[in-house]
Protein backbone atom coordinates (compact mmCIF):
# COMPACT_ATOMS: atom_id res chain seq x y z
CA UNK A 1 0.00 0.00 0.00
CA UNK A 2 1.29 3.74 -0.87
CA UNK A 3 2.53 5.32 2.56
CA UNK A 4 0.69 8.06 4.34
CA UNK A 5 3.36 9.79 5.63
CA UNK A 6 6.83 10.00 5.19
CA UNK A 7 10.31 10.03 7.06
CA UNK A 8 12.00 13.41 7.95
CA UNK A 9 12.80 15.90 5.20
CA UNK A 10 10.84 13.61 2.45
CA UNK A 11 7.11 14.49 1.28
CA UNK A 12 4.52 12.30 -0.33
CA UNK A 13 3.42 13.12 -3.85
CA UNK A 14 1.96 10.50 -6.74
CA UNK A 15 1.52 8.07 -3.94
CA UNK A 16 5.52 8.18 -2.77
CA UNK A 17 7.85 9.74 -0.62
CA UNK A 18 10.87 12.32 -2.68
CA UNK A 19 13.42 13.93 -0.37
CA UNK A 20 13.06 17.59 0.12
CA UNK A 21 15.84 19.81 -1.49
CA UNK A 22 18.21 20.91 1.26
CA UNK A 23 18.45 24.59 2.27
CA UNK A 24 19.92 26.48 -0.24
CA UNK A 25 18.65 24.73 -3.27
CA UNK A 26 15.09 24.80 -5.07
CA UNK A 27 13.09 22.17 -6.45
CA UNK A 28 13.34 21.50 -10.25
CA UNK A 29 11.53 18.13 -10.83
CA UNK A 30 9.96 15.83 -8.14
CA UNK A 31 11.35 12.28 -7.65
CA UNK A 32 9.84 9.74 -9.88
CA UNK A 33 10.13 5.68 -9.11
CA UNK A 34 13.57 5.52 -10.86
CA UNK A 35 14.81 9.09 -10.37
CA UNK A 36 15.45 11.52 -6.92
CA UNK A 37 14.15 14.79 -6.53
CA UNK A 38 16.00 16.85 -8.62
CA UNK A 39 17.54 20.34 -7.09
CA UNK A 40 19.38 22.96 -8.18
CA UNK A 41 21.33 26.43 -6.00
CA UNK A 42 19.43 28.97 -5.75
CA UNK A 43 21.15 31.79 -7.72
CA UNK A 44 23.06 35.05 -6.71
CA UNK A 45 21.08 37.41 -4.32
CA UNK A 46 18.22 34.34 -3.73
CA UNK A 47 17.71 32.04 -0.63
CA UNK A 48 15.97 29.33 0.83
CA UNK A 49 16.33 28.65 4.48
CA UNK A 50 14.58 25.23 5.18
CA UNK A 51 14.31 21.71 3.42
CA UNK A 52 12.06 22.67 0.93
CA UNK A 53 10.01 21.72 -2.36
CA UNK A 54 9.78 25.38 -3.55
CA UNK A 55 10.29 25.69 -7.30
CA UNK A 56 11.56 29.52 -6.79
CA UNK A 57 13.78 30.84 -4.48
CA UNK A 58 13.39 34.20 -2.21
CA UNK A 59 14.95 37.45 -3.40
CA UNK A 60 17.75 38.76 -0.75
CA UNK A 61 15.83 41.10 1.54
CA UNK A 62 17.11 44.93 -0.17
CA UNK A 63 18.31 47.22 2.38
CA UNK A 64 17.17 50.72 1.05
CA UNK A 65 19.20 53.59 1.86
CA UNK A 66 16.64 55.70 1.01
CA UNK A 67 14.37 54.64 3.57
CA UNK A 68 17.56 54.45 5.99
CA UNK A 69 18.85 50.97 5.96
CA UNK A 70 22.17 49.47 5.11
CA UNK A 71 23.39 45.98 5.10
CA UNK A 72 24.44 44.40 8.98
CA UNK A 73 24.79 41.06 7.60
CA UNK A 74 25.11 40.01 4.08
CA UNK A 75 22.64 36.95 2.78
CA UNK A 76 23.72 33.61 1.31
CA UNK A 77 22.10 31.24 -0.36
CA UNK A 78 20.75 30.05 2.79
CA UNK A 79 19.79 33.25 4.65
CA UNK A 80 18.27 36.35 3.96
CA UNK A 81 19.81 39.65 4.24
CA UNK A 82 19.82 41.17 7.95
CA UNK A 83 19.20 44.93 7.54
CA UNK A 84 20.08 47.77 10.06
CA UNK A 85 19.96 51.25 10.30
CA UNK A 86 22.12 53.99 9.54
CA UNK A 87 23.63 56.10 12.56
CA UNK A 88 21.20 57.88 14.39
CA UNK A 89 18.31 55.82 12.99
CA UNK A 90 16.28 52.71 14.08
CA UNK A 91 13.86 49.82 12.90
CA UNK A 92 10.24 50.48 12.95
CA UNK A 93 9.14 46.80 13.05
CA UNK A 94 11.24 43.15 13.92
CA UNK A 95 11.78 42.85 10.35
CA UNK A 96 13.54 46.45 9.70
CA UNK A 97 12.24 47.50 6.75
CA UNK A 98 12.10 51.18 7.49
CA UNK A 99 13.69 53.68 9.90
CA UNK A 100 12.89 56.32 11.72
CA UNK A 101 15.00 58.82 14.25
CA UNK A 102 16.18 57.77 17.53
CA UNK A 103 14.08 60.18 20.16
CA UNK A 104 15.78 62.50 22.26
CA UNK A 105 14.94 62.44 26.35
CA UNK A 106 13.26 65.87 27.22
CA UNK A 107 14.82 67.84 29.95
CA UNK A 108 13.62 65.88 33.33
CA UNK A 109 14.57 63.00 31.78
CA UNK A 110 17.70 60.87 31.00
CA UNK A 111 18.43 58.15 28.46
CA UNK A 112 18.40 54.85 30.35
CA UNK A 113 19.45 52.79 27.25
CA UNK A 114 21.05 54.20 24.33
CA UNK A 115 19.25 53.71 21.10
CA UNK A 116 20.43 50.99 18.44
CA UNK A 117 19.82 50.26 14.98
CA UNK A 118 17.16 48.10 15.78
CA UNK A 119 15.81 49.56 19.10
CA UNK A 120 14.48 53.48 20.28
CA UNK A 121 15.91 55.14 22.87
CA UNK A 122 14.70 54.33 26.58
CA UNK A 123 14.52 57.18 28.31
CA UNK A 124 13.66 57.24 32.49
CA UNK A 125 12.44 60.12 35.08
CA UNK A 126 15.03 62.17 36.21
CA UNK A 127 14.98 60.87 40.12
CA UNK A 128 15.57 63.44 43.05
CA UNK A 129 18.84 64.60 43.48
CA UNK A 130 19.47 64.22 39.52
CA UNK A 131 18.19 66.70 35.92
CA UNK A 132 18.23 67.11 33.15
CA UNK A 133 18.39 70.29 31.26
CA UNK A 134 18.59 69.15 27.83
CA UNK A 135 16.88 67.36 25.15
CA UNK A 136 18.68 64.42 24.50
CA UNK A 137 19.21 60.83 22.75
CA UNK A 138 22.63 60.57 24.79
CA UNK A 139 22.67 62.38 28.14
CA UNK A 140 21.83 60.36 31.11
CA UNK A 141 20.40 62.06 34.05
CA UNK A 142 23.05 64.00 35.91
CA UNK A 143 23.61 64.44 40.08
CA UNK A 144 22.85 67.67 41.19
CA UNK A 145 25.87 69.75 42.38
CA UNK A 146 27.29 69.55 45.98
CA UNK A 147 27.84 72.72 47.19
CA UNK A 148 29.05 71.31 50.92
CA UNK A 149 31.91 69.63 48.62
CA UNK A 150 32.74 73.16 47.39
CA UNK A 151 32.63 74.95 50.64
CA UNK A 152 29.49 76.46 49.09
CA UNK A 153 25.50 76.53 50.59
CA UNK A 154 22.22 75.78 48.38
CA UNK A 155 20.77 79.11 47.39
CA UNK A 156 18.27 77.70 45.25
CA UNK A 157 17.01 73.96 45.35
CA UNK A 158 17.32 71.70 42.61
CA UNK A 159 14.35 69.99 40.24
CA UNK A 160 14.36 67.31 37.77
CA UNK A 161 14.89 69.65 34.90
CA UNK A 162 17.81 72.22 36.85
CA UNK A 163 20.43 72.16 39.06
CA UNK A 164 20.84 73.43 42.35
CA UNK A 165 22.35 76.69 42.24
CA UNK A 166 24.78 76.94 44.77
CA UNK A 167 26.35 80.20 46.52
CA UNK A 168 28.96 81.65 49.39
CA UNK A 169 28.04 81.07 53.16
CA UNK A 170 26.13 83.94 55.07
CA UNK A 171 29.61 84.93 57.55
CA UNK A 172 27.24 87.25 59.33
CA UNK A 173 25.59 83.22 60.84
CA UNK A 174 28.80 82.57 62.15
CA UNK B 1 24.69 9.27 -18.68
CA UNK B 2 23.13 6.01 -17.21
CA UNK B 3 24.44 2.74 -18.43
CA UNK B 4 24.61 -0.89 -17.89
CA UNK B 5 27.04 -3.09 -19.15
CA UNK B 6 27.16 -6.96 -19.05
CA UNK B 7 29.88 -9.40 -19.50
CA UNK B 8 30.50 -13.44 -18.17
CA UNK B 9 28.28 -14.34 -20.83
CA UNK B 10 29.61 -17.34 -23.05
CA UNK B 11 29.29 -20.87 -24.16
CA UNK B 12 28.58 -23.41 -21.21
CA UNK B 13 28.02 -27.13 -20.85
CA UNK B 14 24.97 -28.26 -19.21
CA UNK B 15 26.11 -28.76 -15.46
CA UNK B 16 28.36 -26.37 -15.34
CA UNK B 17 28.37 -22.63 -13.58
CA UNK B 18 28.74 -19.05 -15.42
CA UNK B 19 29.16 -15.40 -13.36
CA UNK B 20 27.81 -12.51 -15.13
CA UNK B 21 28.79 -9.10 -14.08
CA UNK B 22 27.23 -5.99 -14.78
CA UNK B 23 29.10 -2.62 -14.45
CA UNK B 24 26.29 0.35 -13.77
CA UNK B 25 27.64 4.43 -14.04
CA UNK B 26 26.15 7.57 -14.74
CA UNK B 27 23.73 7.00 -11.32
CA UNK B 28 23.96 6.17 -8.13
CA UNK B 29 24.30 2.47 -7.92
CA UNK B 30 23.71 2.28 -4.04
CA UNK B 31 20.19 3.88 -4.42
CA UNK B 32 18.87 1.48 -6.71
CA UNK B 33 17.29 -2.09 -6.49
CA UNK B 34 18.91 -4.17 -9.92
CA UNK B 35 17.50 -6.77 -11.86
CA UNK B 36 18.64 -9.72 -14.35
CA UNK B 37 16.46 -10.11 -17.01
CA UNK B 38 16.93 -13.15 -19.88
CA UNK B 39 15.12 -13.60 -23.36
CA UNK B 40 15.69 -17.07 -25.09
CA UNK B 41 16.26 -17.11 -28.86
CA UNK B 42 12.98 -15.85 -30.74
CA UNK B 43 11.33 -15.51 -27.18
CA UNK B 44 9.76 -13.55 -24.52
CA UNK B 45 11.16 -11.83 -21.53
CA UNK B 46 11.88 -14.16 -18.79
CA UNK B 47 12.83 -12.03 -15.23
CA UNK B 48 15.50 -14.34 -13.36
CA UNK B 49 16.14 -12.09 -9.97
CA UNK B 50 16.07 -8.62 -8.22
CA UNK B 51 18.15 -7.70 -5.47
CA UNK B 52 17.61 -4.56 -3.45
CA UNK B 53 19.34 -1.19 -3.23
CA UNK B 54 21.55 -2.32 -0.15
CA UNK B 55 21.23 -6.04 -0.54
CA UNK B 56 19.25 -6.68 2.48
CA UNK B 57 16.42 -8.80 0.10
CA UNK B 58 16.30 -10.93 -3.18
CA UNK B 59 13.82 -12.46 -4.83
CA UNK B 60 13.96 -15.39 -7.98
CA UNK B 61 11.75 -16.55 -10.76
CA UNK B 62 10.43 -20.16 -10.12
CA UNK B 63 12.84 -21.82 -12.63
CA UNK B 64 16.33 -20.38 -11.03
CA UNK B 65 15.36 -20.85 -7.27
CA UNK B 66 18.54 -22.83 -5.79
CA UNK B 67 20.34 -22.47 -8.38
CA UNK B 68 21.18 -18.77 -9.49
CA UNK B 69 22.38 -16.21 -7.09
CA UNK B 70 22.00 -12.72 -7.19
CA UNK B 71 24.25 -10.30 -5.61
CA UNK B 72 25.89 -6.59 -5.46
CA UNK B 73 29.12 -4.89 -4.44
CA UNK B 74 28.08 -1.26 -4.09
CA UNK B 75 31.86 0.33 -3.51
CA UNK B 76 32.39 -1.24 -6.96
CA UNK B 77 29.09 -0.01 -8.75
CA UNK B 78 28.39 -3.46 -10.10
CA UNK B 79 25.81 -6.73 -10.29
CA UNK B 80 26.27 -10.11 -10.23
CA UNK B 81 24.85 -13.11 -11.08
CA UNK B 82 26.17 -16.37 -10.05
CA UNK B 83 24.63 -19.33 -11.80
CA UNK B 84 25.17 -23.03 -11.18
CA UNK B 85 23.90 -26.42 -12.43
CA UNK B 86 23.14 -24.59 -15.68
CA UNK B 87 20.56 -26.29 -17.89
CA UNK B 88 19.95 -25.73 -21.89
CA UNK B 89 16.95 -24.16 -21.09
CA UNK B 90 18.86 -21.21 -19.66
CA UNK B 91 20.06 -19.80 -23.07
CA UNK B 92 19.48 -16.70 -23.38
CA UNK B 93 20.48 -13.32 -23.91
CA UNK B 94 20.65 -11.89 -20.09
CA UNK B 95 20.08 -7.91 -19.48
CA UNK B 96 20.82 -6.14 -16.36
CA UNK B 97 18.08 -3.40 -15.56
CA UNK B 98 17.62 -0.53 -12.90
CA UNK B 99 15.45 -0.90 -10.50
CA UNK B 100 13.22 1.85 -8.03
CA UNK B 101 14.92 4.35 -5.86
CA UNK B 102 15.27 3.56 -2.23
CA UNK B 103 13.15 6.33 -1.56
CA UNK B 104 10.49 4.62 -2.90
CA UNK B 105 8.61 2.65 0.00
CA UNK B 106 8.89 -1.08 0.50
CA UNK B 107 8.38 -3.14 -2.47
CA UNK B 108 8.78 -0.76 -4.96
CA UNK B 109 12.18 -1.41 -6.33
CA UNK B 110 11.12 -3.99 -8.81
CA UNK B 111 10.32 -1.81 -12.17
CA UNK B 112 12.66 -1.12 -14.61
CA UNK B 113 13.70 1.66 -16.73
CA UNK B 114 17.60 1.38 -17.91
CA UNK B 115 18.71 -1.68 -19.83
CA UNK B 116 22.08 -3.23 -20.44
CA UNK B 117 22.83 -4.38 -24.32
CA UNK B 118 22.88 -7.81 -22.63
CA UNK B 119 25.09 -10.57 -22.75
CA UNK B 120 24.39 -14.18 -24.58
CA UNK B 121 24.98 -17.28 -22.05
CA UNK B 122 24.30 -20.22 -24.22
CA UNK B 123 24.14 -23.57 -22.52
CA UNK B 124 24.86 -26.41 -25.21
CA UNK B 125 26.60 -30.01 -24.53
CA UNK C 1 3.90 -17.66 -11.78
CA UNK C 2 0.49 -16.12 -13.18
CA UNK C 3 1.50 -14.60 -16.26
CA UNK C 4 -0.80 -12.15 -17.51
CA UNK C 5 -2.36 -12.43 -21.20
CA UNK C 6 -1.48 -10.75 -24.72
CA UNK C 7 -2.57 -11.22 -27.72
CA UNK C 8 -0.01 -12.34 -29.41
CA UNK C 9 -0.07 -10.09 -32.62
CA UNK C 10 -1.92 -6.95 -33.65
CA UNK C 11 -2.14 -5.49 -37.08
CA UNK C 12 -2.74 -1.11 -37.50
CA UNK C 13 -2.12 1.61 -40.13
CA UNK C 14 -0.20 4.43 -39.56
CA UNK C 15 -2.37 7.47 -38.10
CA UNK C 16 -4.43 5.41 -36.37
CA UNK C 17 -4.46 4.07 -32.94
CA UNK C 18 -4.10 0.66 -31.02
CA UNK C 19 -4.64 -0.68 -28.03
CA UNK C 20 -2.84 -3.22 -26.89
CA UNK C 21 -4.07 -5.85 -23.95
CA UNK C 22 -2.59 -7.25 -20.84
CA UNK C 23 -5.03 -9.32 -19.02
CA UNK C 24 -4.02 -10.48 -15.57
CA UNK C 25 -5.87 -13.75 -14.52
CA UNK C 26 -8.57 -13.40 -11.42
CA UNK C 27 -7.65 -13.32 -8.42
CA UNK C 28 -4.68 -10.44 -9.52
CA UNK C 29 -6.63 -6.97 -9.05
CA UNK C 30 -6.55 -4.84 -11.84
CA UNK C 31 -7.16 -1.89 -10.12
CA UNK C 32 -4.56 -2.15 -8.21
CA UNK C 33 -1.77 -3.54 -9.81
CA UNK C 34 1.28 -1.18 -11.31
CA UNK C 35 1.50 -2.33 -14.73
CA UNK C 36 4.45 -1.79 -16.68
CA UNK C 37 5.31 -1.34 -21.00
CA UNK C 38 7.97 -1.68 -22.51
CA UNK C 39 8.51 -2.09 -26.34
CA UNK C 40 11.42 -4.04 -27.57
CA UNK C 41 12.99 -3.75 -31.27
CA UNK C 42 14.84 -6.68 -32.89
CA UNK C 43 18.56 -6.31 -32.12
CA UNK C 44 17.96 -4.07 -29.21
CA UNK C 45 17.32 -4.16 -25.64
CA UNK C 46 13.72 -3.34 -24.25
CA UNK C 47 13.04 -0.15 -23.63
CA UNK C 48 10.24 1.43 -20.67
CA UNK C 49 7.42 3.13 -21.88
CA UNK C 50 5.45 3.64 -18.99
CA UNK C 51 4.12 2.65 -15.47
CA UNK C 52 0.21 3.10 -14.53
CA UNK C 53 -1.67 2.33 -12.08
CA UNK C 54 -4.25 5.03 -12.10
CA UNK C 55 -4.25 8.87 -13.84
CA UNK C 56 -2.94 10.08 -10.31
CA UNK C 57 -0.09 7.70 -10.31
CA UNK C 58 1.69 7.25 -13.31
CA UNK C 59 4.71 7.42 -15.24
CA UNK C 60 5.97 8.37 -18.24
CA UNK C 61 9.61 6.83 -19.10
CA UNK C 62 11.87 9.52 -20.08
CA UNK C 63 11.86 10.67 -23.91
CA UNK C 64 8.72 8.72 -24.16
CA UNK C 65 6.38 10.52 -26.80
CA UNK C 66 2.84 11.31 -25.15
CA UNK C 67 1.02 9.09 -27.87
CA UNK C 68 2.01 6.30 -25.45
CA UNK C 69 -0.22 6.22 -22.33
CA UNK C 70 -1.70 3.77 -20.00
CA UNK C 71 -5.12 3.23 -19.17
CA UNK C 72 -6.97 0.01 -17.55
CA UNK C 73 -10.13 -1.73 -18.35
CA UNK C 74 -11.70 -2.99 -14.77
CA UNK C 75 -14.61 -5.02 -16.47
CA UNK C 76 -11.88 -7.36 -17.86
CA UNK C 77 -9.37 -6.71 -15.48
CA UNK C 78 -6.67 -5.57 -17.71
CA UNK C 79 -4.23 -2.99 -17.95
CA UNK C 80 -4.32 -1.00 -21.78
CA UNK C 81 -1.52 0.78 -23.61
CA UNK C 82 -2.79 3.20 -25.97
CA UNK C 83 -0.83 4.26 -28.86
CA UNK C 84 -2.42 7.32 -30.67
CA UNK C 85 -1.36 8.18 -33.95
CA UNK C 86 0.46 5.28 -35.23
CA UNK C 87 3.79 5.51 -37.03
CA UNK C 88 6.23 2.76 -39.27
CA UNK C 89 9.07 2.85 -35.82
CA UNK C 90 6.54 1.70 -33.47
CA UNK C 91 6.44 -1.89 -35.19
CA UNK C 92 7.73 -3.16 -32.16
CA UNK C 93 7.09 -6.21 -29.67
CA UNK C 94 5.62 -4.52 -26.58
CA UNK C 95 5.65 -6.49 -23.56
CA UNK C 96 3.68 -5.46 -19.99
CA UNK C 97 4.82 -6.40 -16.69
CA UNK C 98 3.52 -6.42 -12.81
CA UNK C 99 4.51 -7.52 -9.71
CA UNK C 100 2.98 -10.52 -7.87
CA UNK C 101 3.91 -12.71 -5.06
CA UNK C 102 7.30 -11.40 -4.57
CA UNK C 103 8.23 -12.04 -8.30
CA UNK C 104 8.43 -9.46 -11.35
CA UNK C 105 5.91 -11.25 -14.20
CA UNK C 106 6.25 -10.47 -17.78
CA UNK C 107 3.06 -11.00 -20.56
CA UNK C 108 4.16 -12.87 -23.29
CA UNK C 109 4.21 -10.15 -25.46
CA UNK C 110 2.22 -8.44 -28.59
CA UNK C 111 3.64 -8.06 -31.63
CA UNK C 112 2.25 -4.55 -33.22
CA UNK C 113 2.66 -4.36 -37.51
CA UNK C 114 2.54 -1.19 -38.63
CA UNK C 115 0.71 -1.99 -42.13
CA UNK C 116 1.66 -0.37 -45.29
Known amino acids: EPPTACREKQYLINSQCCSLCQPGQKLVSDCTEFTETECLPCGESEFLDTWNRETRCHQHKYCDPNLGLRVQQKGTSETDTICTCEEGLHCTSESCESCVPHRSCLPGFGVKQIATGVSDTICEPCPVGFFSNVSSAFEKCRPWTSCETKDLVVQQAGTNKTDVVCGPQDRQRA | QVQLVESGGGVVQPGRSLRLSCAAS????????MHWVRQPPGKGLEWVAV????????YYGDSVKGRFTISRDNSKNTLYLQMNSLRVEDTAVYYC??????????????????WGQGTTVTVSS | QAVPTQPSSLSASPGASASLTCTLRSGINVGSSRIYWYQQKPGSPPQFLLRYTSDSDKLQGSGVPSRFSGSKDASANAGLLLISGLQSEDEADYYC?????????FGGGTKLTVLG
Open chain 3, 97 to 105: MIWHSSAVV
Open chain 2, 97 to 114: TRGGGHWNYEGHYYGMDV
Open chain 2, 26 to 33: GFTFSSHG
Open chain 2, 51 to 58: IWYDGSNE
